[in-house]
Amino acid sequence: EEELQVIQPDKSVLVAAGETATLRCTATSLIPVGPIQWFRGAGPGRELIYNQKEGHFPRVTTVSDLTKRNNMDFSIRIGNITPADAGTYYCVKFRKGSPDDVEFKSGAGTELSVRAKPSAPVVSGPAARATPQHTVSFTCESHGFSPRDITLKWFKNGNELSDFQTNVDPVGESVSYSIHSTAKVVLTREDVHSQVICEVAHVTLQGDPLRGTANLSETIRVPPTLEVTQQPVRAENQVNVTCQVRKFYPQRLQLTWLENGNVSRTETASTVTENKDGTYNWMSWLLVNVSAHRDDVKLTCQVEHDGQPAVSKSHDLKVSAHPKEQGSNTAAENTGSNERNIY
């Protein structure tokens, strides 16, 4: 009779994580008598996966009844596969011996590759807000996928971005991989409602990529423009002055009125109006008693937006018998959001 051969017909097997891998092995002879063992890897550091003779291998089941003497099918199934199970598996025939069984012949090996889905991409933006025209960086991370080949794209409001750098780690062979990408985005005043999307495509996703998103509302600060206007006389000795705070985001904003440099009133924006682009408008009124002033009055609307240095706009109020409507239309830059009318 020909000498026993151990046949592993599959050079490689590809299995999705969580599924069961079948590793096939047959022997061409019943002799010599002795157990079959399965190992992952070769050499002295090889890992025992299954021993026909003894041991407890809860994830391994045999395809046929290995207790039977006439059995020559030594195929096994390994359940609940994870990327850590990837490697080359060897079916090895031993002959009975003492004190240990003696390795007789090994199969050629079957490489088990595990397809593992990437984790949901996590997109994170800068720690601090930035203003329009500035460039900010967003990062996208996804982990635990295999094989290594993966595609990552960036989008802003559906438009693909091109300014990004991507790394897949580790560079060498591994049971699973991670991807890290950094994209640069130039902010515009219209970006309050914008989204940045990181899209990951992988063979395990069957054409349905995973997406991670970041809202630019978390990143952008649109500073307000200020306009101080003198309204027509409301009463014989009173002048109504308004400060219009326009196009700011986020809403956090504090306004202070100064009369000739002295604080007259401070208020916080609460009831604001929202613009279509997501920015806010707010207006504050100041009623000035002209009779209390003998000289001209310098009124200043000072706005502190989202913790930034204050910006201001001034208006000179002429004290005369018949005050005329006067106005000032100079814009002041800053970032903020919210609106309330104050009387």
Epitope: K53, R69, N71, K96
Partner: antibody, heavy 118, light 107 residues
């Protein structure tokens, strides 16, 4: 049903010959190692011979050169040819199947009695 | 040849008892050891192979352990049908050899 049935046991004179048979049924006979084991009256068990699936044969020193084990797979039969019999060969002879992957005996026949006496 | 020594040679016990029979090999036999049960006028019946694995159909009250040279057979709760003679056998090396037997008798 897996079964082994021995036959051929007899009363024989010292120096004589005898051929024992074991008929196997219920399993793929050619795929199993087969063994003969004997038990002397009031004594323990003694392994007598083995034949592998490839026809390889094994004997203990006590019977080597006198006993010959053989198999006929087409007939699902195992044989033990016993020559130059001695009084010490008197025993119940069992055939047994090396039925497990490691050749542990899993099935035994009911035995056949061989008596060597003048 | 490898010598197999069983102890005790005989043992008296009662129904419900737990009993252990030991078997020692004269040299290391790995764990290729079998246990058999034999009742008067009957063929031996296989109980355990590879020192600790139960043959198909054998109740779990029988258990085997050991490796190398020292082995044991334990019957956890004796029933009337368990009173018989028990043999160990090594089948690592030819010639395969048996222990001399342990006769388990009812007390």
């Amino acid at each position: 049903e897996v079964q082994l049935v021995e036959s051929g046991g007899d009363l024989i004179q010292p120096g004589g010959s005898l051929r024992l048979s074991c008929a196997a049924s219920g399993f793929s006979f050619s795929s199993y190692d087969m063994h003969w084991v004997r038990q002397t009256t009031g004594k323990g068990l003694e392994w007598v011979s083995a034949i592998g699936t490839a026809g390889d044969t094994y004997y203990p020193g006590s019977v080597k050169g006198r006993f010959t084990i053989s198999r006929e797979n087409a007939k699902n039969s195992l044989y033990l040819q016993m020559n130059s019999l001695r009084a010490g060969d008197t025993a119940v002879y069992y055939c047994a199947r090396g039925g497990n992957w490691d050749d542990a005996f899993d099935i035994w026949g009911q035995g056949t009695v061989v008596t060597v006496s003048s | 040849d490898i010598q197999m020594t069983q102890s005790p040679s005989s043992l008296s016990a009662s129904v419900g008892d737990r009993v252990t029979i030991t078997c020692r090999a004269s040299q290391d036999i790995n764990n290729y050891l079998a246990w058999f049960q034999q009742k008067p006028g009957r063929a031996p019946k296989s109980l355990i192979f590879t020192a600790s694995r139960l043959q198909s159909g054998v109740p779990s009250k029988f258990s085997g352990s050991g490796s190398g040279t020292d082995f044991s057979l334990t019957i956890s709760s004796l029933q009337p049908e368990d009173f018989a003679t028990y043999y160990c056998q090594q089948y690592t090396f030819y010639p395969y050899t048996f222990g001399q037997g342990t006769k388990l008798e009812i007390k």
